[in-house]
């Protein structure tokens, strides 16, 4: 008989982000013998699986073990084999699943146990899979860039490891976008979080956190766009949608079924004389901009300051990482650089905005044309949320980092997910001796 | 030495019930996933099922001619892996052998004797 | 689930020749296939694990190949003792299957 091979002096994780829009799984490396230390995990392999979300899945719930194959036999190949069984993997579902959850408990709970079933038959330490609630979105992804930045070391360094990095060890604030949701967490400068449900405390590294976080569901940019349309076709004369939001000269037909399937359109839903109608695309940035504020119920707010929709938000603090959505679509707009100004992203948009649609087809063919002639709207939008719904200035925009990947590992809240459920995030500074379990968060 | 030990073999009757045990010995069987494979007379190897560890909650697969009326389970403490066997059916007449690998996974490394079930009327 | 098909069902040989065993799985598994010998009222040995690797304590005149779908178990010089059945099993995914097995005889 053979002898258990002696593990690698490294070890493995995987986690699965089940997005509203796709799945991604990652895969994240670290010595063994530094468990406890900051910034020694790092993402090794990002694998994107072919298709939609998860949450699309209700009524073929039987293609769901095929639709996970390719990117769990990529992490077999990328994982050596000796390593399988000790490799946990979690996966995370956010808002998609969220929203299914709302319209039918039963059928999100059977999509997932059928994507338990189909991940429990791979060779890996299979530890669940859930929905995470927007708060821990929030959280993890606060986690996941300021451990990559190095904010959690005690050690005070005279050199730079990353760009963002200024050498304090105050923590970014994180921006996170994503089709159905959208959080923003930061710690506030010495102000009370009025309301409860946007407080968390952790205690990492020996050090205390008091941090804001709020989760917006509906507000990611696929559902916002949905929450749109639902909008503005309520006082539309006909079948015609004159859009602004997208460029002149886009026609594309819209199933009024389709428009009320999510949860977000329903406080817009109304009996519409037609099945169908038609966006036609007039591309102007202004016009755009407003109708998206529409969105943002600022009227009302029962604290000393809101976002939007009655939503406390304290004063904004420190620089920000903007990720996911946020940093994919500024960087195909080409906006992501540190020296654009509020005023030149604004710029910016309104001439993308008023470029003819045959035009943009030619100038990114190798594009695919549904998320080609999205990307008008989602600037527009990431730009109202940034300014209205969350108070960005001219002034305070150069504090936001566009960030894709930090240290090569992917901005996002799967990096802090997996950090927290191997116990890797010490509440105390660590020692020589590694602690036991119950001092971390 | 590495020994797996199975018993509780036997005649039942089509419909009946039977449980297998399996003793191992040698090796720190808390650590390994377990496994039954079987061999009607004759005929070639069937792979019954699996046991995984408690940190994976003790996760069970089956072959699907045995899903639903067969259940694995595993005594840590003891040292010993169980096969439940209800509504047999004269097509579970076989040899059951318990097995593990104790180098990496799915493949059997490690063979008990054997114990035969007969479902027979 | 993936079907292993071996060829030939029975292979009639002489001692010191050499024995060529086929083993073709449904579809490609990789290198996730492994080889057990058995004799009469014997349990199965392992003889070949990860398509190639060999056993510590396995005559070295057995030897393995192939990934994909195509493999191939090679016995150099057959001696009295290799005389047995032998089967090929899926180590890729669930649930394992195991092929229908060869049965090498004394020609």
């Known amino acids: 008989t053979q002898n258990k091979a002696l593990p690698e002096n490294v070890k493995y994780g995987i986690v699965l982000d089940a997005g509203s829009s796709h799945t991604s799984l990652y895969i994240y490396k670290w010595p063994a013998e530094k468990e406890n230390d900051t910034g020694v995990v790092h993402q090794v392999e990002e694998c994107r699986v072919k298709g939609p979300g998860i949450s699309k899945f209700v009524q073929k719930v039987n293609e769901i073990g095929i639709y996970l194959t390719d990117c769990m036999e990529r992490a077999r190949e990328v994982i050596p084999r000796s390593q399988h069984q000790e490799t946990p993997v979690y996966l995370g579902a956010t808002a998609g699943m969220r929203l299914l959850r709302m319209e039918s408990e039963e059928l999100a709970d059977r999509v997932l146990d059928v994507v338990e079933r189909s991940l429990s038959n791979y060779p890996f330490d299979f530890q669940g899979a859930r929905i995470i609630t927007g708060q821990e979105e929030g959280a993890y992804g606060w986690i996941t860039i300021n451990y990559l930045l190095g904010k959690f070391s005690q050690k005070t360094r005279w050199f730079s490891i990353v760009p963002y990095e200024t050498n304090n060890q105050e923590t970014f604030g994180a921006l996170d976008l994503g089709g159905a949701s959208t959080q923003v967490t930061f710690v506030p400068q010495n102000q009370t979080i009025e309301s409860p449900d946007n407080a968390l405390q952790f205690r990492l590294y020996g050090k205390d956190y008091n941090v804001y976080t709020h989760s917006f569901l509906c507000y990611g940019k696929d559902q916002a766009l949905w929450q749109k349309l639902a909008k503005d076709i309520q006082v539309a004369s006909n079948e015609i949608l004159r859009d602004p939001c997208f460029h002149p000269g886009y026609k594309k037909v819209v199933n009024v079924s389709d428009l009320y399937k999510t949860p977000c359109t329903k406080r817009f839903e109304m009996t519409l004389p037609f099945q169908q109608f038609e966006i036609q695309g007039i591309g102007n940035y202004q016009q755009c901009h407003q109708s998206i504020l529409e969105l943002f119920n600022t009227s009302y707010c029962p604290y000393s300051q809101c976002a939007f929709n009655g939503i406390f938000l304290p004063p904004l603090q420190g620089d920000f990482g903007a990720f996911s959505a946020f940093y994919f679509v500024m960087k195909f707009l080409n906006l992501t650089s540190e020296k654009v100004s509020q005023e030149k992203v604004t710029e910016m948009m309104k001439k993308f905005c008023a470029q003819p649609w045959e035009e943009i087809k030619t100038s990114y063919a190798g594009v695919k044309e549904k998320y080609l002639s999205e990307y008008c709207f989602s600037g527009t939008y990431i730009l109202s949320l940034l300014l209205q719904g969350y108070h960005f200035t001219a002034d305070s925009w150069e504090h936001i980092h566009f960030i894709g990947k930090i240290q090569g590992s992917d901005a996002g809240w799967t990096l802090g997910y997996m950090l927290n459920l191997t116990n890797m995030i010490p509440a105390e500074q660590p020692l020589s001796t590694p602690l036991s379990h119950s001092t971390y968060v | 030495e590495v020994q797996l030990v199975e018993s509780g073999g036997g005649l039942v009757k089509p419909g009946g019930s039977l449980r297998l045990s399996c003793a191992a010995s040698?090796?720190?069987?808390?650590?390994?996933?377990m496994n039954w494979v079987r061999q009607a007379p004759g005929k070639g190897l069937e792979w019954v099922g699996e046991?995984?560890?408690?940190?994976?909650?003790?996760?069970?697969h089956y072959a699907e001619s045995v899903k639903g009326r067969f259940t694995i389970s595993r005594d840590d403490s003891k040292n010993t892996l169980y096969l439940q066997m209800n509504s047999l059916k004269t097509e579970d007449t076989a040899v059951y052998y318990c097995?593990?690998?104790?180098?990496?996974?799915?493949?059997?490394?490690?063979w008990g004797q054997g114990t035969t079930v007969t479902v027979s009327s | 689930e993936i079907v292993l098909t071996q060829s030939p069902a029975t292979l009639s040989l002489s001692p010191g020749e050499r024995a060529t065993l086929s083993c073709r799985a449904s579809?490609?598994?990789?290198?996730?296939l492994h080889w057990y010998q058995q004799k009469p009222g014997q349990s199965p040995r392992l003889l070949i694990y990860?398509?190639?690797q060999s056993i510590s304590g396995i005559p070295a005149r057995f030897s393995g190949s192939g990934s994909g779908t195509d493999f191939t178990l090679t016995i150099s010089s057959l001696e009295p003792e290799d005389f047995a059945v032998y089967f090929c099993?899926?180590?890729?995914?669930?649930?394992?299957?195991f092929g229908g097995g060869t049965k090498l005889e004394i020609k």
């Open positions: 040698g090796f720190t069987f808390s650590k390994y996933w």
């Open positions: 579809q490609s598994i990789s290198d996730y």
């Open positions: 099993q899926n180590g890729h995914s669930l649930p394992l299957t």
């Open positions: 990860y398509a190639s």
């Open positions: 046991i995984r560890l408690k940190s994976n909650k003790y996760g069970t």
């Open positions: 097995t593990t690998q104790l180098d990496l996974y799915w493949f059997f490394d490690v």
